[in-house]
Interface confidence: medium
Amino acid sequence: KKVVLGKKGDTVELTCTASQKKSIQFHWKNSNQIKILGNQGSFLTKGPSKLNDRADSRRSLWDQGNFPLIIKNLKIEDSDTYICEVEDQKEEVQLLVFGLTANSDTHLLQGQSLTLTLESPPGSSPSVQCRSPRGKNIQGGKTLSVSQLELQDSGTWTCTVLQNQKKVEFKIDIVVLAFQKASSIVYKKEGEQVEFSFPLAFTVEKLTGSGELWWQAERASSSKSWITFDLKNKEVSVKRVTQDPKLQMGKKLPLHLTLPQALPQYAGSGNLTLALEAKTGKLHQEVNLVVMRATQLQKNLTCEVWGPTSPKLMLSLKLENKEAKVSKREKAVWVLNPEAGMWQCLLSDSGQVLLESNIKVLPTWSTPVQP
């Protein structure tokens, strides 16, 4: 018995060939011996089967001795053994119809899971293998789960259903929605303007949702909401903004925030969340602000940083074009009785300078100048 696999919603063509290359009488029946279709001379006749409006043949092939059964808009329950009766012979074809559906919208947030469910006819025992566009493979039976979706999983997944050594292929488009960066860090001198950017990793025509930036200042005991906003068709509108600091937000994507001045009391970590319309869960991006201040009070030259710095960062004070006077893996360094000249405070990581602040130390009878 020949086995043919079909896809739910598709069209299948079951073949039936006579030895005589001419139009002769034929009938297609199902396993219950109910007539589906046949011919009467050059006319197509249909029987009382449930396939009535979805069954057809190709009259143009009858003269060549080919009498196909075409079934449109396949349903799982169309799975059956179909019998072609021609020239006192019976040709049997077993049709197995499968469907593969996602349990949710296939636009998912990074980190979420996708479950694919295979609809299959009773008595079948198919195996399924799905391959991502970048070569990740998952295997399963009636259900397959892709957990912890990553950006790289975006694209057309190809799922192959295997039954009786025959294959049928399904294509499923998956879009993983995410920010380009999971986290970012901004280094600024005290008083400088701060720009925070939150680019999305995908491009869509219409994007609607709402978002909020929560901020945990290093000096504060609890976090606070700095700004809430709405997003409508890529247009950003601010709903509520804190009085201190007075944040500004760009009106277009990518999401862009401006802090007029970097001050020690603002140094810390923020979490921007974005809830997209018709999506469960939220997109997250962490942002960190490190602020540096160099000061001279009487005979003490001090350099301090505030904010989330890693223990391997080095803070140094040095006189221009000279070796560092002091260099420590700490958040504050100082020099007593600094000599006159341009001093540099440097925050560096493995020799790469992340932040630099200059302070001019004048001879002891004058006051310091901060350029």
């Epitope: 293998q129 391959r131 991502s132 566009p133 970048r134 070569g135 990740k136 493979n137 998952i138 295997q139 950006l151 790289q152 975006s154 694209g155 057309t156 488009d173 998956i174 879009v175 380009q180 680019p199 990793a201 995908f202 491009t203 869509v204």
Partner: antibody
Framework: QVQLVQSGAEVKKPGASVKVSCKAS????????ISWVRQAPGQGLEWMGM????????TYAPKFQGRVTMTRDTSTSTVYMELSSLRSEDTAVYYC?????????WGQGTLVTVSS | DIVMTQSPLSLPVTPGEPASISCRSS???????????LDWYLQKPGQSPQLLIY???NRASGVPDRFSGSGSGTDFTLKISRVEAEDVGVYYC?????????FGQGTKVEIK
């Protein structure tokens, strides 16, 4: 950690075949396709084809179709690339890389020299 | 097959200065899902290539944030904000939209 370790350098005569191995470790072998990419001396990168370790299915670049065969051994988490009817222009470093399109981990490369 | 064209083919750089490499594809790499299927790889002298950027603008894990990718459709750019001595090598763009994936000719970045 993820590692792809390839077999050593080979010297072959024109017309012969070469079989290069790539042993994967540090992840589930059947969960990712393995591609082969070659680089002729002083030249750029050229994708040759890929194999899906889970079922052994292959896709080859049209240029290598009929000359290249990719196989896998799931018991040793190893994939193989065999190139036949070698000619001098096949002299290159052959890399295995994890992924079908977009390669996050690469082997160290195997130099194949074709010379009479 | 999609043809990838890079420019310049050679780029002398000064440490601490920015650098930029351009890549153009013969057809759009923007998938209907909103992602651009373009990767950037760096092959340091004597080493295997390594993934820098995937899906046009997303840094691979462990890649310093001085590297950034931008562009959409057929025109893409890889930028290095401040070149370091360890960044020398050949940079390749690669389209990952279709099989077979195809690479640009490569851009050799060397210190002046």
């Amino acid at each position: 950690q993820v590692q792809l370790v390839q077999s050593g350098a080979e010297v072959k005569k024109p017309g012969a075949s070469v079989k290069v191995s790539c042993k994967a470790s540090g992840y589930t072998f059947t969960s990712y396709d393995i591609s082969w990419v070659r680089q002729a001396p002083g030249q750029g990168l050229e994708w040759m084809g890929m194999i899906s370790p889970s079922d052994g299915s292959t896709t080859y670049a049209p240029k290598f179709q009929g000359r290249v065969t990719m196989t896998r051994d799931t018991s040793t988490s190893t994939v193989y690339m065999e190139l036949s009817s070698l000619r001098s222009e096949d002299t290159a470093v052959y890399y295995c890389a994890r992924g079908a399109v977009g390669f996050d981990y690469w082997g160290q490369g195997t130099l194949v020299t074709v010379s009479s | 097959d999609i043809v990838m064209t890079q420019s310049p083919l050679s780029l002398p750089v000064t440490p601490g200065e920015p650098a930029s490499i351009s890549c153009r594809s013969s057809q759009s790499l923007l998938h209907s899902n909103g992602y651009n299927y373009l990767d950037w790889y760096l092959q340091k002298p004597g080493q295997s290539p390594q993934l820098l950027i995937y899906l046009g603008s997303n840094r691979a894990s462990g890649v310093p944030d001085r590297f950034s990718g931008s562009g959409s459709g057929t025109d893409f750019t890889l930028k290095i904000s401040r070149v370091e001595a360890e960044d020398v090598g050949v940079y390749y763009c690669m389209q990952a939209l279709q099989t077979p994936p195809s690479f640009g000719q490569g851009t050799k970045v060397e210190i002046k």
